[in-house]
């Protein structure tokens, strides 16, 4: 399928001009290659009429140009002084020959319609209203006023001043006079449809002395706006229907042959195909609203329409706006798993893509909620603190410049299952949707912290150990201190990895963290985790409470979070040999690092990018202090 996109049908009238925009994928080659506009002949040959190389055919001389807009990845063909001879089939395309990538465009140029000389032309969009002005002489002031629509032989009454109204105009047509002007009456017709288009006659009075006026009403379907979007990216339909429908329910639908199937409306209807990846947002009191769809699929391409009606469904004679969405499969957005699987008590690491050209943009992670119009409250962001209910179990790690940031969520419960969005304050196309599935755990956790009852005593030494299975033998292990700005990694030593024995003793695999002496600032959440290079895997969390020394004090666990962390995990969750296609929650890059490491990253491979947020939280970077040293048992 060609990735070139443009208008399928263009219509105009003789003497007018057209402007045709064609879109191409965002690549350097495409930006610089030849662009062309050619006319298709009966033989299938396509004869160049104009190209970006400077060629201009004789029949286009002095009336056409082609302009490339590389910053928009579009080129525009402008043609003036149209004649009926310009009607035909064309291609806009890219390449050194006219057999390159292209898009078919049909151009129809029709004759200017012949109208009576005194005809007043009104041009209105479907669903809108028109007010027709009907002047008359003073002597006809007391007489009957009327508007009729011309049919083949007669003129069919629309409305008159004696309250006679054609049934098809009841509730839509009003005849009135303004102010003290006794020489004009008006007819307003609302909820215009294609059937309303045609010639009308205004009349005041009867017989030969009657005042008459010819009116031509043109009712136009809105031109679809072209939207060119990459696969897996997002699109926003900005719908501005006007103040007159501000209080009506709004909808977005997709054309399906003759009908338009509602995808979402403000009454709570939502197509299941868009679950987790769509929001409808009222913008203001003037009837403006937008619909955002993320995680675009190739089957999302098509003709969309937004509108307003109390039913929340498309209704003839109500204002609409339309779009033609093209989904370019040559996407710059990396193909990531759209489903991540975890188990209760376990953890997931989610890699979120962003536009690498916008490394300084703010990164966010939000949870999609489908109630009402749908919304996505931010749970964590590079400059947004973690939401309270996610304390100790959620962190976002930015890796400037590599096009990925990582979100880790641990202590999973079944309530965490749902849809999440990766988004930035930069290029909105790079919004992606992840579905998190959480199954009940069926086996022991891979990572287990002892003691479970983690209460440290002020001024004393306190050690916690993180036990891991032999399958993590070759992976790096770490401890980090969580804050709502990230998880600051602490230097540690791994006893298991130092053993020279080839065999793996299940009971002796542990990595320990010692606080010596314990201070009040040490209280908080700590994570133990494993990683392979820059790919972060499973984590488990523990809350360490700090108490003052008291005689015979019994340590009470301040939270049930440690109990949660004990729930069993499926071993496969961190098996890095599993292929992406299985949609397991295999480890994703999680750039825990401290500040000193960050400065040396430079332009290494993207997995090695590390985050200032992850390790530079004020008051957290105490890893060099003698109070935090890590040893083995």
């Amino acid at each position: 399928k060609s990735p070139i996109f443009g208008p399928q049908e263009v219509s105009s009238i003789e003497g007018d001009s057209v402007s045709i925009t064609c879109y191409y994928p965002d690549t350097s080659v495409n930006r610089h290659t030849r662009k062309y506009w050619c006319r298709q002949g009966a033989s299938g040959m396509c004869t160049t009429l104009i190209s970006s190389n400077g060629y201009l055919s004789k029949e286009y001389s002095g009336r056409a140009n082609l302009i490339n807009f590389p910053e928009n990845n579009t080129f525009v063909i402008n043609i003036e002084q149209l004649t009926q001879d310009d009607t035909g089939s064309y291609k806009c395309g890219l390449g050194t020959s006219n057999r390159g990538l292209s898009f078919d465009v049909s151009l129809e140029v029709s004759q200017v319609p012949e109208l009576p000389s005194d005809t007043h032309v009104y041009t209105k969009d479907i669903g809108r209203n028109v007010t027709i002005e009907c002047p008359f002489k003073r002597e006809n002031a007391p007489s009957k006023k009327s508007l009729c629509k011309k049919t083949n032989q007669s003129c069919e009454l629309v409305i008159d001043s004696t309250e006679k109204v054609n049934p098809s105009y009841i509730g839509r047509a009003k005849l009135f006079m303004k102010g003290t002007d006794l020489t004009v009456f008006y007819v307003n017709i609302s909820h215009l449809t294609h059937n309303d288009a045609g010639l009308y006659i205004c009349q005041a009075g009867e017989g030969p002395s009657a005042d008459k006026k010819n009116v031509d009403l043109q009712v136009l379907a809105p031109e679809p706006e072209l939207l060119y979007k990459d696969l897996r990216s997002s699109v926003t339909f900005e719908c501005d229907l006007g103040r007159e429908v501000a209080n009506e329910a709004k909808y977005l639908c997709r054309m399906n042959k003759e009908t338009c199937d509602v995808i979402i409306n403000t009454l709570g209807k939502r197509d299941p195909d868009f679950e987790g990846r769509i929001l409808i947002t009222p913008k203001d009191d003037n009837g403006r609203f937008s619909v955002l769809i993320t995680g675009l699929r190739k089957e999302d391409a098509g003709h969309y329409q937004c509108g307003a009606h109390s039913s929340g469904l498309p209704q003839e004679g109500w204002p609409i706006q339309t779009w033609q969405l093209f989904v370019n499969e040559e996407s710059t957005i990396p193909n990531r798993r759209s489903v991540v699987k975890g188990v209760t008590g376990g953890s997931v690491a989610i890699a979120c893509p962003y536009n690498p050209k916008e490394s300084s943009s703010l990164k966010y992670w939000c949870r999609w909620e489908g109630d009402g119009n749908g919304h996505c409250p931010v749970l964590v962001g590079t400059q947004a603190q973690v939401q309270e209910e996610y304390e100790g179990r959620l962190a976002l790690f930015d890796q400037p410049g590599n096009g990925t940031y990582t979100v880790i969520l641990n202590q999973l419960t079944t309530e965490d299952a749902g849809f999440y969005w990766c988004l930035t304050n930069g290029d909105s196309r790079w919004r992606t949707t992840i579905e998190l599935q959480v199954a009940e755990a069926t086996r022991e956790p891979n990572l287990e912290v002892t003691p479970q009852n983690a209460t440290a005593v002020l001024g004393e030494t306190f050690t916690v150990s993180c036990h891991y299975p032999c399958k993590f033998y070759s992976q790096e292990k770490y401890w980090c201190k969580w804050s709502n700005k990230g998880c600051h990694i602490l230097p540690s030593h791994d006893e298991g990895a130092r053993q020279s024995s080839v065999s793996c003793d299940q009971s002796s695999q542990l990595v320990s963290m010692t606080l010596n002496p314990v201070s009040k600032e040490d209280e908080g959440w700590y994570w133990c985790g494993v990683k392979q290079g820059q790919t972060y895997g499973e984590t488990t969390a523990i809350y360490i409470a700090v108490e003052e020394r008291t005689r015979g004090s019994s340590h009470v666990n301040p939270t049930d979070a440690n109990a949660r962390a004990k729930v069993a995990l499926e071993e496969e969750v961190v098996d890095s040999s599993i292929s992406e296609k299985e949609n397991k929650a295999i480890p994703n890059p999680g750039p825990f690092a401290n500040e000193r490491e960050i400065q040396n990253v430079g332009d290494q491979a993207q997995e090695n990018r590390a985050s200032g947020d992850a390790g530079s939280a004020d008051g957290q970077s105490r890893s060099s202090s003698s109070k935090h040293h890590h040893h083995h048992h």
Epitope: S161, L175, M177
Partner: nanobody
Framework: QVQLVESGGGLQQAGGSLRLSCAAS????????VGWFRQAPGKEREFVAA????????YYADSVKGRFTISRDNAKNTVDLQMNSLKPEDAAVYYC??????????????????WGQGTQVTVSS
């Protein structure tokens, strides 16, 4: 603006007659239709009759057809309602209403934008 004032209400025996009058003032050239409505205690306001100002046409509720007549006097800017063969169920407050547009729906009270204060009609049996 258009101002409307009703007169002619009162007590009448069943079978008798009354003539109500509605005097319009202000920007009366914009008035397209004038109607009479009535409201009995505890009941909805209901349409009685209407007359168009530009090209004379009259409309009546089924319940008063043949008994009531609506007419206009353009020179005096008045609209009258002649009520004959009165019945006890005709007793109500009668309102004169005007609207500045025609739409083919002349019998809905919420389509009228100007209203008088009303005049009481009582019918004794």
């Amino acid at each position: 603006q258009v101002q409307l004032v009703e007169s002619g209400g009162g007590l009448q025996q069943a079978g008798g007659s009354l003539r109500l009058s509605c005097a319009a003032s202000g920007r009366t050239v914009t008035v397209m239709t004038v109607g009479w409505f009535r409201q009995a205690p505890g009941k909805e306001r209901e349409f009685v009759a209407a007359i168009t100002m530009y090209g004379e046409r009259t409309y009546y509720a089924d319940s008063v057809k043949g008994r009531f007549t609506i007419s206009r006097d353009n020179a005096k800017n008045t609209v009258d309602l002649q009520m004959n063969s009165l019945k006890p169920e005709d007793a109500a407050v009668y309102y004169c209403a005007a609207r500045t547009y025609v739409s083919g729906i002349y019998d809905r009270f919420d389509d009228y934008n100007y209203w008088g204060q009303g005049t009481q009609v009582t019918v004794s049996s």
